[in-house]
């Protein structure tokens, strides 16, 4: 607010007042009179820049008059009372109400004193963020979508992620005249490493006390990525039984595991138990390439592992033997 004047009457008002579309707003305006100064106010006037005439007048004997009586009201001025508060309430704010207004006091003996106030008409946007479920494409595609609907002015959308990615932001007119809907897409080359990771959409707007953060959990559909674990290249005759595991990452989840060898079906010492393969103790050396084939909705992928059971001294911690 402007500092009070010294030795003269001063009109005090904020330089800018925010109001929300469809709501009411008060344009505050007061006459500040120094202690030793005498002033008499005979009229309060509100006018809009660029428009002829005044929109609201409070006359000392005639009382209030309004250009739009249903939308305007002096909040404090009363007939027979000292006119020091010219604050004006505006109802049902419209986009076209945004602009510069002059609040003016007609005073005696100082003459008229005025101040300008900028009325900002805001609309608080509604924000949503959603995942764009994708498959492996090999090229950049939208993986998340953030929409700020019906903001005035348009909201600012930014993305926060340690995955890289690029935003693509567009604007279209909102449902209510003068509002804007902002859509931002987060674009990245899909990979299995990105699946299940989070990105954050940050929406900033004048009407928010603090930015709104919306988290999106990314979804990438991909066929199984398969590996076999549990073999340490150190299996010997006469050692305990062992287990191999078919490790599969996929989205959606695997629907089936199939164990085989390069020669065909599993040998008797290998027993399939879903994702696991039980290797029973053997009494003669073997050299077999095992295959795990994993299926999901997008296809099947396989991994191979060559297993050798060798002759040699059994150790305490490895190998296969009968107990």
């Amino acid at each position: 607010w402007p500092p009070p004047g010294t030795g003269d009457v001063v009109v005090q008002a904020p330089t800018q007042v925010p109001g929300f579309l469809g709501d009411s707003v008060t344009l505050p305006c007061y006459l500040q009179v120094p202690n030793m100064e005498v002033t008499h106010v005979s009229q309060l006037t509100w006018a809009r820049h660029g428009e002829s005439g005044s929109m609201a007048v409070f006359h000392q004997t005639q009382g209030p008059s309004y250009s739009e009586s249903k939308r305007l009201e002096f909040v404090a001025a009363r007939l027979g009372a000292e006119l020091r508060n010219a604050s004006l309430r505006m109802f049902g704010l419209r986009v076209e109400d945004e602009g510069n207004y002059t609040c003016l006091f007609v005073t005696f003996p100082q003459g008229s004193r005025s101040v300008d106030i900028w009325l900002r008409v805001l609309a608080k946007p509604q924000n949503t963020a959603e995942v764009q479920k994708v498959q492996l494409t090999g090229e950049p595609v939208p993986m998340a979508r953030c929409v700020s609907t019906g903001g005035r002015p348009p909201a600012q959308i930014t993305w926060h992620s340690d995955l890289g990615g690029m935003p693509n932001t567009s604007q279209v007119p909102g449902f209510l005249s003068g509002t804007v809907t902002v859509t931002s897409l987060w674009i990245l080359v899909p990979s299995s490493q990105v699946d299940g990771k989070n990105v954050t959409c940050k929406v900033e707007h004048e009407s928010f006390e603090k930015p709104q953060l919306l988290t999106v959990n990314l979804t990438v559909y991909y066929p199984p990525e398969v590996s076999i674990s549990g073999y340490d290249n150190n299996w010997y005759l006469g050692q305990n039984e062992a287990t191999l595991t078919c490790d599969a990452r996929s989205n959606p989840e695997p629907t089936g595991y199939n164990w085989s060898t390069t020669m065909g079906p599993l040998p008797p010492f290998a027993v399939a138990q879903g994702a696991q393969l039980l290797i029973r103790p053997v009494d003669k050396p073997i050299n077999t390439t095992l295959i795990c084939n994993v299926t999901n909705a997008l296809g099947a992928r396989q991994a191979e592992l060559t297993v050798q059971v060798k002759e040699g001294p059994p150790s305490e911690h490895s190998g296969i033997s009968r107990n």
Epitope: H40, S54, Q60, F108
Partner: antibody, heavy 114, light 107 residues
Framework: QVQLQQPGAVLVRPGASVKLSCKAL????????MHWVRQTPVHGLEWIGA????????AYNQKFKGKATLTADKSSSTAYMELSILTSEDSAVYYC????????WGQGTTLTVS | DVVMTQTPKFMSTSVGDRVSVTCKAS??????VAWYQQKPGQSPKALIY???YRYSGVPDRFTGSGSGTDFTLTISNVQSEDLADYFC?????????FGAGTKLELK
């Protein structure tokens, strides 16, 4: 009903002074300022000055400073304007009025300096 | 001082006509303009304040408009009782000043 009572006509000699009166009826005298306006065929309507009876604050047109002195008596709801060192140039109809604050003006005092 | 230049000085009209009187201020006076009517042998009477607002009791054929420096008083459907002098006045800054007047007379 608002009335502003002024004497109809006053005749004075050049060099003399005169005190014109204006009695306010029908509204609270101390609520707003009383203005004095003169009218001549040559200059039309001219604002002389005003007084706020509630506070005694005055404002003058520079042209009439030293010529006109405004006072008000709250007890009788009467405003006064004293004009000094009169010349024929001061011959005019003098009105008291709250101006734009109310519709009404006094009937005016015709001052003849001769 | 703010000079209020009023035109025309004289205007001939007939009953039922629509007439306009204009006032131009030498500087911006916002909407702090009043219009007065003065009939022969009478004191002025206020018609309009704040450029466009009629006092209660003033017929709605009297309309004021304008802001800044240009102001207009329009009388639509002129009646015989409207034949008078009309003055504009600014009350934005002291000293208060008047226009020179417009005499409305019958053709």
């Amino acid at each position: 009903q608002v009335q502003l009572q002024q004497p109809g006509a006053v005749l004075v000699r050049p060099g003399a002074s005169v005190k014109l009166s204006c009695k306010a009826l029908g509204y609270t005298f101390t609520d707003h300022e009383m203005h004095w306006v003169r009218q001549t065929p040559v200059h039309g309507l001219e604002w002389i000055g005003a007084i706020h009876p509630g506070s005694g604050v005055t404002a003058y047109n520079q042209k009439f400073k030293g010529k006109a002195t405004l006072t008000a008596d709250k007890s009788s709801s009467t405003a006064y304007m004293e004009l000094s060192i009169l010349t024929s140039e001061d011959s005019a109809v003098y009105y008291c009025t709250p101006l734009w604050l109310r519709r009404d003006w006094g009937q005016g005092t015709t001052l003849t300096v001769s | 001082d703010v000079v209020m230049t009023q035109t025309p000085k004289f205007m001939s009209t007939s009953v039922g006509d629509r007439v306009s009187v204009t006032c131009k201020a030498s500087q911006n006076v916002g909407t702090n303009v009043a219009w007065y009517q003065q009939k022969p042998g009478q004191s002025p009477k206020a018609l309009i304040y704040s450029a466009s607002y009629r006092y209660s009791g003033v017929p709605d054929r009297f309309t004021g408009s304008g802001s800044g420096t240009d102001f207009t008083l329009t009388i639509s459907n002129v009646q015989s009782e409207d034949l008078a002098d009309y003055f504009c006045q600014q009350y934005n800054t002291y000293p208060l000043t008047f226009g020179a007047g417009t005499k409305l007379e019958l053709k």
